[in-house]
Structure formats: structure tokens, C-alpha cells
């Protein structure tokens, strides 16, 4: 019982849920629910039954595997997704899988909180601007990585001569795509012009 | 919360029928079975029939063949179960419960709080 | 019809005892069995299906074991809100029949 499999996609993909293992023989009805109680198809050795969700029209059972399709994945669609298989001998037996849908990244902009020259030195402060999503950040001063310390949505720094950078990037990804915003200074410590 | 409410208490005379209803909650009411079982004052559990949701398919138990009646209305998610030709032997308390699956499973996972039916002259 | 036999009729215990209820099918019936449990003048609620499941929300101290035609629904360690009246039920064929209950009373 209880077997959880976790899964990221993207949203308006097309997913198909199943499980690593084959189904038990001569099973008798095969369910998915999403969430408790909320059933989306159930096979019955005669024919696929979908009944009225908001997946209607959108999923397919494969009876063979089990594996359920279902196209255009939206954020809506997060929930706990779970196959119960009754046995020829009454025995139940279930697997879940826990979906979660993401939309892509927005390409995040660049936006220059502070730059000032101190002696030879510039200190500089950028902050890497998404509307409210739940990301990693990750700077890069001319494609090589700050340390992981500063990988946050403020790039906060004072660069020496040695290690000045002229372009710097922030990457923003979660699990299913990334995007980078750059910006460029010319040195030693003003903004270059676009 | 899952949930099934039947309708109240009826007093009938012998020879009239009845008509309990129980209503559904709480789960996608065309995917699961109701069952109607029925238990007169002192006795045991018996089984009475069993309707689809999904397709009104139904089983009844053989001694009420002929005599039960047991449907569905989607729109409401509301099972009705019809007794016709009463006797004082059909005094009984009776209850629904639902099927674990749209094909009857056997497997009845939730119940109504029941329905007193008396019969008398 | 399948017959279900139950045994005892009656059982008397205390709080804190393990209870052990029989049901034996009149014919093979694999794990297609439920337990049900009755309080007076309440509906019946399910406790255990497929033999062995035990239905969500129903406390650990329930267990169910068996096949075919024994089976066996144990209380571990009775608490004050298990005294009721306790069915079997075959799933494997219609018409579904029921044990005639087994009574658990205060000792």
C-alpha cells in the first residue's frame, strides 16, 4: 500500500502516469482518483468508465499497463494521483503519484540597485526580478559562477581590478526550464550602455 | 467528507410501497455502487440489491425480486430504493451504503444512518 | 447463497483484552471478506475489507486475517468504544450474506 512516486512537468505538456511495476494478473477494476475519493476512470474488464472531473475529455486509461494520459497539464492539476487495482482474490492494492505542474520561468530582468567606484574597487549591487515565483538563482560574471553563497536574488559584491566582470548574469530555473537576464558594465565600474 | 443521508422515518400499511432516498456527498457519485441493506428489529444484516451510479445496472436479492426497485438520479447524486407490496415482515430498519467501485465490488466503505420503514394495519 | 457462520455469539470482555471473532465461509470465497461494526440503534460502520485492509480512519488495534473459508477479525487491546455487535460480509458473489453478528459486551 501506499507506494509514492513523485513527479515534475511542465504546464501544457502532455503526462503520462504510471507505475515502474506490471500490473497484477487478471486484475478485476483498475481506479484512478485524483486527490481522496475524486475518481477520474475505472476499468472493469469490460470497458473504461470516465466519469465527470475537470479531466474529462483530456485522459486516456491504457488497460494493458494501467498508465493513465493526460493531455495540457495545467498548475490546477497538482494533486496526488492514485491507482487502486482490485484482485481476482479481493485483495486491493494501490500506488500514488504525487504530480506537480509547473509553468516556465519568465525571463527575469536585471534591475541595477547600486554601482559605485571605491577606490579601484567597485561595489555592486543587482537584484534579479521574476513576478512571485518559487525558483534558484544563479549569478555568473562573464559565464563563471559566483560562489554559492551570493546564488540568491540579490547579487550583493565588491569586485577587485583582478576579478572584475563585464557582463553578469542571472539565471533563474526551477525543475522543468531555466532563463537568464544579462547585464553589461564597461569597466571599470559604470553601466555600459545597451 | 464522504457522506450519504437518507430520507426520514415512514409508518405504511400492508400492500402500500415506499420510496427511501440517500443522498450522496463529497465523492464523484457516478463512480461507485449503492447498496441497500436492510435489518429488521432484534435481527441480523441483509443484503437487498445493488445499483450503478455510473449506468443504473442493478442485482437484487432473490427473495424481493419482482417487488424492489433501485435507481439513481446523477443530477442530484441521490439513490432511491422502491418497496412495493409491503407486509409486516418488510418492518425493518434500512440503510445505504456505498459500493467501493462503479461494478459492484462487494466492498461497502460508507453508510447512511438509515431509514425506519414500519409496516402496520 | 454463501453462509457465513460466526463464532461466538457473544463474547464477554474487559478493557484491555485482546478478542479474537471467527467467520467461516460455507464455500471458498478468497480474500473477498469485510467487517463491519454496529453500535445500538446506529448504522453499521466497516472496519476491514479484503480480508486484511483496514479502512481509513479505523484504529490499529483492528486487525483482519484469512482465506478462503476462515477468518478472523482481532481486537488488540479493547477499548471502551469497541463494546458493539460485529459482522462478516462475503464480497465474492451475490447475494452478499452476512455472519449473524457476534456480540461484544462489557465483562
Known amino acids: 500500500q501506499g507506494h509514492l512516486v513523485h513527479m515534475t512537468v511542465v504546464s501544457g505538456s502532455n503526462v503520462t502516469l504510471n507505475i515502474s511495476e506490471s500490473l497484477p494478473e487478471n486484475y478485476k477494476q483498475l481506479t484512478w482518483f485524483y486527490t481522496f475519493d475524486q475518481k477520474i476512470v475505472e476499468w472493469d474488464s469490460r470497458k473504461s468508465k470516465y466519469f465527470e472531473s475537470k479531466f474529462k475529455g483530456r485522459v486516456r486509461l491504457d488497460p494493458q499497463s494501467g498508465a493513465l494520459y493526460i493531455s495540457k497539464v495545467q498548475k490546477e492539476d497538482n494533486s496526488t494521483y492514485i491507482m487502486r487495482v482490485l484482485k481476482k482474490t479481493g485483495n486491493e492494492q494501490e500506488w500514488k503519484i504525487k504530480l506537480q505542474v509547473l509553468d516556465p520561468v519568465p525571463k527575469p530582468v536585471i534591475k541595477i540597485e547600486k554601482i559605485e567606484d571605491m577606490d579601484d574597487n567597485c561595489y555592486l549591487k543587482l537584484s534579479c526580478v521574476i513576478p512571485g515565483e518559487s525558483v534558484n538563482y544563479t549569478w555568473y560574471g562573464d559565464k563563471r559562477p559566483f560562489p554559492k553563497e551570493l546564488q540568491n536574488s540579490v547579487l550583493e559584491t565588491t569586485l577587485m581590478p583582478h576579478n572584475y566582470s563585464r557582463c553578469y548574469t542571472c539565471q533563474v530555473s526551477n525543475s522543468v526550464s531555466s532563463k537568464n537576464g544579462t547585464v553589461c558594465l564597461s569597466p571599470p565600474c559604470t553601466l555600459a550602455r545597451s | 467528507q464522504v457522506q450519504l443521508v437518507q430520507s426520514g422515518a415512514e409508518v405504511k400499511k400492508p400492500g402500500a410501497s415506499v420510496k427511501v432516498s440517500c443522498k450522496t456527498s463529497?465523492?464523484?457519485?457516478?463512480?461507485?455502487?449503492i447498496t441497500w441493506v436492510r435489518q429488521a428489529p432484534g435481527r441480523g444484516l441483509e443484503w437487498m440489491g445493488w445499483?450503478?451510479?455510473?449506468?443504473?445496472?442493478?442485482d437484487y436479492a432473490q427473495s424481493l425480486q419482482g417487488r424492489v426497485t433501485m435507481t439513481t438520479d446523477t443530477s442530484t447524486s441521490t439513490a432511491y430504493m422502491e418497496l412495493r407490496s409491503l407486509r409486516s415482515d418488510d418492518t425493518a430498519m434500512y440503510y445505504c451504503?456505498?459500493?467501493?467501485?462503479?461494478?459492484?465490488?462487494?466492498?461497502?466503505?460508507?453508510w447512511g444512518q438509515g431509514t425506519l420503514v414500519t409496516v402496520s394495519s | 447463497d454463501i453462509q457465513m457462520t460466526q463464532s461466538p455469539s457473544s463474547v464477554s470482555a474487559s478493557v484491555g483484552d485482546r478478542v479474537t471473532i471467527t467467520c467461516r465461509a460455507s464455500?471458498?470465497?478468497?480474500?473477498?471478506l469485510a467487517w463491519h461494526q454496529q453500535k445500538p440503534g446506529k448504522a453499521p460502520k466497516v472496519l476491514i475489507y479484503?480480508?486484511?485492509s483496514l479502512h481509513s480512519g479505523v484504529p490499529s488495534r483492528f486487525s483482519g486475517s484469512g482465506s478462503g473459508t476462515e477468518f478472523t477479525l482481532t481486537i488488540s487491546s479493547l477499548q471502551p468504544e469497541d463494546f458493539a455487535t460485529y459482522y462478516c460480509?462475503?464480497?465474492?458473489?451475490?447475494?452478499?450474506?452476512f455472519g449473524q453478528g457476534t456480540k461484544l459486551e462489557i465483562k
Open positions: 463529497g465523492y464523484t457519485f457516478a463512480g461507485y455502487g
Open positions: 451504503a456505498r459500493d467501493r467501485y462503479s461494478s459492484s465490488s462487494g466492498y461497502f466503505d460508507y
Open positions: 479484503a480480508a486484511s
Open positions: 464455500q471458498g470465497i478468497s480474500s473477498w
Open positions: 445499483v450503478s451510479a455510473y449506468n443504473g445496472d442493478t
Open positions: 460480509q462475503q464480497a465474492n458473489t451475490f447475494p452478499y450474506t
